[in-house]
Amino acid sequence: ETVHCDLQPVGPERGEVTYTTSQVSKGCVAQAPNAILEVHVLFLEFPTGPSQLELTLQASKQNGTWPREVLLVLSVNSSVFLHLQALGIPLHLAYNSSLVTFQEPPGVNTTELPSFPKTQILEWAAERGPITSAAELNDPQSILLRLGQAQGSLSFCMLEASQDMGRTLEWRPRTPALVRGCHLEGVAGHKEAHILRVLPGHSAGPRTVTVKVELSCAPGDLDAVLILQGPPYVSWLIDANHNMQIWTTGEYSFKIFPEKNIRGFKLPDTPQGLLGEARMLNASIVASFVELPLASIVSLHASSCGGRLQTSPAPIQTTPPKDTCSPELLMSLIQTKCADDAMTLVLKKELVAHLKCTITGLTFWDPSCEAEDRGDKFVLRSAYSSCGMQVSASMISNEAVVNILSSSSPQRKKVHCLNMDSLSFQLGLYLSPHFLQASNTIEPGQQSFVQVRVSPSVSEFLLQLDSCHLDLGPEGGTVELIQGRAAKGNCVSLLSPSPEGDPRFSFLLHFYTVPIPKTGTLSCTVALRPKTGSQDQEVHRTVFMRLNIISPDLSGCTSKG
C-alpha cells in the first residue's frame, strides 16, 4: 500500500542533521601494519571562496608502535584556512602554499606540492613511499586521520568508489544532510516521527552509529518516535534529550546505559516502507526524514514538537529573532543524577551559552547549598540527608533554583531521585480485561491480560514496558510479545494504561505442535522515565513471572512451538 506523504525539504530552522562519516566518494586504505613511513594523500574539493578546515592527526599506539614518519599530501582546489593538530607526530606536510594558509604556524616540516593533476600527485607521493591511504573529500569541515590504523583489504592502496575508510579517516561534511518532512495523510493527533536511514557502505564490519537527538521543546509537549534504519551490521547508541519511542534495526542502547543492548526489528529498507512504519506507529507528521552514508555520529536538531510542519521555503520572519535567554529551555537542560545516596545536578555551560543565558547562581531549595563552577559546567551535589531534601517512601525530592541575569525572579524546577531500595515491580496476569482477578495460568487460545505495577507509585515518573517475551523452555522456545515498546505480531495488543498509569497489554497463545509446555516464564523489561527532565534518570528493571499452561482448545493465533 502506498503511503501518501509527500516528502519536501524542511527549513534548517525546523530541523538540521550533521554527521561524521568514514565513507568517501573515492578512497583506499592499505594494510600497513608496521610501516616505517606512512604516506597519506587527501584530495579536498571546496566550493569557491576561502574555507576553514580542522585537520587532526591522531597516533594510535597499537602494539606500542607508530610510524616513524608520516607524509601527508594535501591537495586542495581553492583557498583554505587550515587548523592543524598533530601533537607529537613526526609529520612532513606537502601542500600548495598559495592555497593553504595555517591559522597558526604548523610546527611541522613542510614541502611545496607542485600544481599537478591528481594522477601525478599520486605518483609524486608514491615516489616518497608506498601510499597508505588516499581519499577524495567534498567540502569537509573537519577531518580526523588516525595513524597506525590502516587495515585495508589489500596490502597496497587501490582507489575504490564509495570507499569506507574504516578507522583510518573520519570526516564531517560542512553541508548538513538534506532533511525532508511531510504530513501522513489520514492520521489524527500530533505524534511526530524522525526517520534516519543509514545507507550501506562497502565494509560490512560491525558498526555503532551514535545518534544525538536534540528536540527543542518542553518535555511534556512531545509525542515522538525515532525510527533508525540501517544495514544489519549497524547498531545504535542513542543520546536524546527527550523521551521518545524508539524503533530501530539491529540493536540499540542508550548513552546512559551503553552496556544494555535492546534488540531492534526488521524494518523496511525503502523510504516508502519507512513512511509506512511511521504511519503504523500512529505518527501524523514526519518531522524529519534523512538518508545518510554510513556514519559514525549523527546529530539531529529539530524544533517541531509535534506542531505544524513547515517545509522550505520558510515564511519571512516579521519579528526579530529571539536572542534572549529562554528560562524554560534553560531549566530543561539541568541533568539530574542519582547515585551513592546523593543527588547531583549538572548544567553544561556550553548549552547555557548557546541559549544566550547568563547564570548568576544555581542552588537547591536551601540557598546555602550552592553549585560548584567546574570550568565547563556547574555541578550541584548533596546527600539525601541535607540541603532540604524531602524523602518519601519512593522518592527523594528537591528544587533546583536558578538565578539568571535577564530575570528578576529565580527559576524553579522540581528535581527527583528514585529511592530504588523501596521500589518493587510486579507483573500481574489476569484472565479478563477488567484486571480484577490475578492468575498464574494461561490457556492457549484464550486471551491473557498483563499489567505491570510499581509500588509505591511514583507520580513524577512514567512506567513503560520496553519489552516482554514468554520463555517456554526447550520445546516451546521464546515468544516475543513486545519489542521496543511495541506489540509484536497481531495477537499482541498494547492496551490503555490503568488509571494509575500502569502499562497493560494482552496476548493470545497457540501451539501447532506437541508436546505443549506445561510452564513458562513471562519476562518483561520495564523503564521508569521522568515525565520531565533528562533521560539520565531512567531506570530499567526486568521482572519475571512463572506461568502454568493448561491444555488448549484449537483456536488462537500466536504460533510457536
Epitope: K26, C28, Q31, V41, T119, L122, E123, A125, A126, E127, R128, G129, P130, I131, A134, S153, L154, S155, F156, C157, M158, L159, E160, A161, S162, H202
Partner: antibody, heavy 119, light 111 residues
Framework: EVQLLESGGGLVQPGGSLRLSCAAS????????MSWVRQAPGKGLEWVST????????YYADSVKGRFTISRDNSKNTLYLQMNSLRAEDTAVYYC????????????WGQGTLVTVSS | NFMLTQPHSVSESPGKTVTFSCTRS????????VQWYQQRPGSSPTTVIY?????PSGVPDRFSGSIDSSSSSASLTISGLKTEDEADYYC??????????FGGGTKLTVL
C-alpha cells in the same frame, strides 16, 4: 621515463617450468604494486597475479593458483613470475604491468614476452 | 564471480561516433571503477579511461567513459573517429573477490 622490459619467455613442454623477469626503471619500484597479465593468441587479456610494493602480499587468479609464484627483488628493480606445471592453456604473451599509484588500473605495460607450452 | 561482457566487434566510418558497452553479469557496475584499455595490433595495451570517466594525460578528449547503474553497464564513446583508433578495446573492473577482471574485448574497425 617509466620502462618495463619482460624476458624469459620461450617454448616449454607441458608440465615444465619457466621463469619470467621484468626489469623496471624510471620510478621508485618498491612503492608500486606490480602485476602479470597474459593474452592467449587471438584472445583477450587475463589478469594472472599481483604483488605488493614490499613483496609481502601476493594475489593470484584461480587458473594459476598453486602453480605460479610472483616475487620481486626491490634492490634489483625486478619482478618475477615462476611458472611450474605448465599447461597448453598457459600459452600466451605475458605482460608485466604497473598498478597506478592508489589507482585501480594498470598505467604502464611492458612489451610482453611469449610463452608457448607445447609438446 | 561475475563476468564482463563486451560485443565482439564494432565498425564505423571516420568522423563518426562509436560507443562500446561492457555489461557486468551480476552485481552492480557502480560498486567500483571501470577502466578501458586500447590495444592496437601488435602493441601492448594502454589506458584510455580509468575510474569510469577519467582520461590519462595524452589521451584526446574524443574518448569519454560513463556508467549506467540501471543496466549495470559501462560505456566507452569515441567521437570524431580516426583510422588510428582501429584497435581492440577492453573494459576492466576490480572486485575484492575476483580481483582484476577484464571483458572479452571489442574489435573496432574504422571503415
Amino acid at each position: 621515463e617509466v620502462q618495463l622490459l619482460e624476458s624469459g619467455g620461450g617454448l616449454v613442454q607441458p608440465g615444465g617450468s619457466l621463469r619470467l623477469s621484468c626489469a623496471a626503471s624510471g620510478f621508485t619500484f618498491s612503492s608500486y604494486a606490480m602485476s602479470w597479465v597474459r593474452q592467449a593468441p587471438g584472445k583477450g587479456l587475463e589478469w594472472v597475479s599481483t604483488i605488493s610494493g614490499g613483496g609481502h602480499s601476493t594475489y593470484y587468479a584461480d587458473s594459476v593458483k598453486g602453480r605460479f609464484t610472483i616475487s620481486r627483488d626491490n634492490s634489483k628493480n625486478t619482478l618475477y613470475l615462476q611458472m611450474n606445471s605448465l599447461r597448453a592453456e598457459d600459452t600466451a604473451v605475458y605482460y608485466c604491468a604497473r598498478i597506478a599509484p592508489a589507482g585501480p588500473h594498470f598505467d604502464y605495460w611492458g612489451q610482453g614476452t611469449l610463452v608457448t607450452v607445447s609438446s | 564471480n561475475f563476468m564482463l561482457t563486451q560485443p565482439h566487434s564494432v565498425s564505423e566510418s571516420p568522423g563518426k561516433t562509436v560507443t562500446f558497452s561492457c555489461t557486468r553479469s551480476s552485481g552492480s557496475i557502480a560498486s567500483n571503477f571501470v577502466q578501458w584499455y586500447q590495444q592496437r595490433p601488435g602493441s601492448s595495451p594502454t589506458t584510455v579511461i580509468y575510474e569510469h570517466n577519467q582520461r590519462p594525460s595524452g589521451v584526446p578528449d574524443r574518448f569519454s567513459g560513463s556508467i549506467d547503474s540501471s543496466s549495470s553497464s559501462a560505456s566507452l564513446t569515441i567521437s570524431g573517429l580516426k583510422t588510428e583508433d582501429e584497435a581492440d578495446y577492453y573494459c576492466q573492473f576490480y572486485d575484492r573477490n575476483s580481483h582484476w577482471v577484464f571483458g572479452g574485448g571489442t574489435k573496432l574497425t574504422v571503415l
